[in-house]
């Protein structure tokens, strides 16, 4: 029986070059928690594992750091960050439990003032 | 290439006990969680236990949680089965595998060895 | 736990067909779907997992779709190393269970 459930940080937005921080808490279940994955769509970001820590996949090296906790910090934000991410938490006996956050990259208002007005 | 062996499986008698062995090579054994998995006689395959990398954790189906325990050494890039309490229906053949949990998948497997409970 | 079942114990198709085997599960398993080949000779190889992400070295023949609790394997141009049984597991809930399997012979 799944009793438990997953809070995230929901919908969130960022600036352009910025950085997030995706966050996911999975409570009401004494379930054992072994692993959790990070994806975005059929990607694989990172993995904090129980026995092993944390690993960033290859791809994302530059770009993801580990934590706050079990959570993920994704930097240098581009619009191409755009998307659904989900956090995939394995536990026993329990099972996965998938948390899901919509992330949306904006365009830094200093891009747009930049675009808009033209510095003689 | 990834390679995993199973050894130590035999004819025994009900409520007796029995270790089988994995050796794996080919890949880094100690980053790996690891799964047995039994074909019984009828072909039906059945997970059976499942151990984290570093060996923190165990997980067990209720039909064999008390009378078998998964361990690993990793320096030895082995995987163990401890059986006990053998019934006629843990007649099958044990399989090791690997337990990807990036795929939510055992992503390669052993040839097996057999177990066979009987008096 | 959740059931998985195969409904087509065995099936018969002639090299160069177009193959469908199915799987469904007891319960909403989220696409934590894998797909499994035995060989005759009881080797036995990871085809697809997550329901449709075919694993390395895996010919591109063989794909995977569905949802919910509706599952299948489709072999797009059967050949005859094809011979197997083909097992569907769910990765989502322990106990992970499999189904019954899906001889798959040839005509």
């Known amino acids: 029986m799944m009793t438990g459930t997953i809070e995230t940080t929901g919908n969130i937005s960022a600036e352009k070059g910025g950085s997030i921080i995706l966050q996911c808490h999975l409570s009401s279940t004494t379930a054992q928690v072994t692993q959790v994955n990070w994806e975005q769509q059929d990607q694989l970001l990172a993995i904090c594992n129980a026995d092993l820590g944390w690993h960033i996949s290859p791809s994302f090296k530059d770009r993801v750091a580990p934590g706050p906790g079990l959570g993920l910090t994704l930097q240098s934000l581009t619009v191409n960050d755009t998307g659904e991410y989900f956090c995939i938490y394995h536990t026993y006996p329990d099972g996965t439990y998938t948390g899901r956050i919509f992330l949306e990259v904006l365009e830094s208002s200093v891009a747009e003032h930049g675009a808009r007005f033209q510095i003689p | 290439e990834v390679q995993l062996v199973e050894s130590g499986g035999a004819l025994v008698k009900p409520g007796g006990s029995l270790k089988l062995s994995c050796a794996a090579s080919?890949?880094?054994?100690?980053?790996?969680?690891m799964s047995w998995v039994r074909q019984t006689p009828e072909k039906r395959l059945e997970w059976v236990a499942t151990?984290?990398?570093?060996?923190?954790?165990?997980y067990y189906p209720d039909s064999v949680k008390g009378r078998f325990t998964i361990s690993r050494d990793n320096a030895k890039n082995t995987l163990y089965l401890q059986m006990s309490s053998l019934r006629s229906e843990d007649t099958a053949l044990y399989y090791c595998?690997?337990?990807?949990?990036?795929?939510?998948?055992?992503?390669?497997w052993g040839q097996g060895t057999s177990v066979t409970v009987s008096s | 736990d959740f059931q998985m079942t195969q409904t087509t114990s065995s099936l018969s198709a002639s090299l160069g067909d177009r193959v469908t085997i199915s799987c469904r599960s007891s319960?909403?398993?989220?696409?934590?779907l894998n797909w499994y080949q035995q060989k005759p000779d009881g080797t036995v190889k990871l085809l697809i997992y997550?329901?449709?992400r075919l694993h390395s070295g895996v010919p591109s023949r063989f794909s995977g779709s569905g949802s919910g609790t509706d599952y299948s394997l489709t072999i797009s141009n059967l050949e005859r190393e094809d011979i197997a049984t083909y097992f569907c597991?769910?990765?989502?809930?322990?106990?992970?269970?499999f189904g019954g399997g899906t001889k798959l012979e040839i005509k």
């Open positions: 595998a690997r337990w990807l949990l990036s795929l939510y998948a055992m992503d390669y």
């Open positions: 151990i984290s990398s570093g060996g923190s954790y165990t």
């Open positions: 080919g890949f880094t054994f100690s980053n790996y969680a």
């Open positions: 319960q909403d398993i989220s696409n934590y």
């Open positions: 997550r329901t449709s």
């Open positions: 597991q769910q990765g989502k809930t322990p106990p992970y269970t």
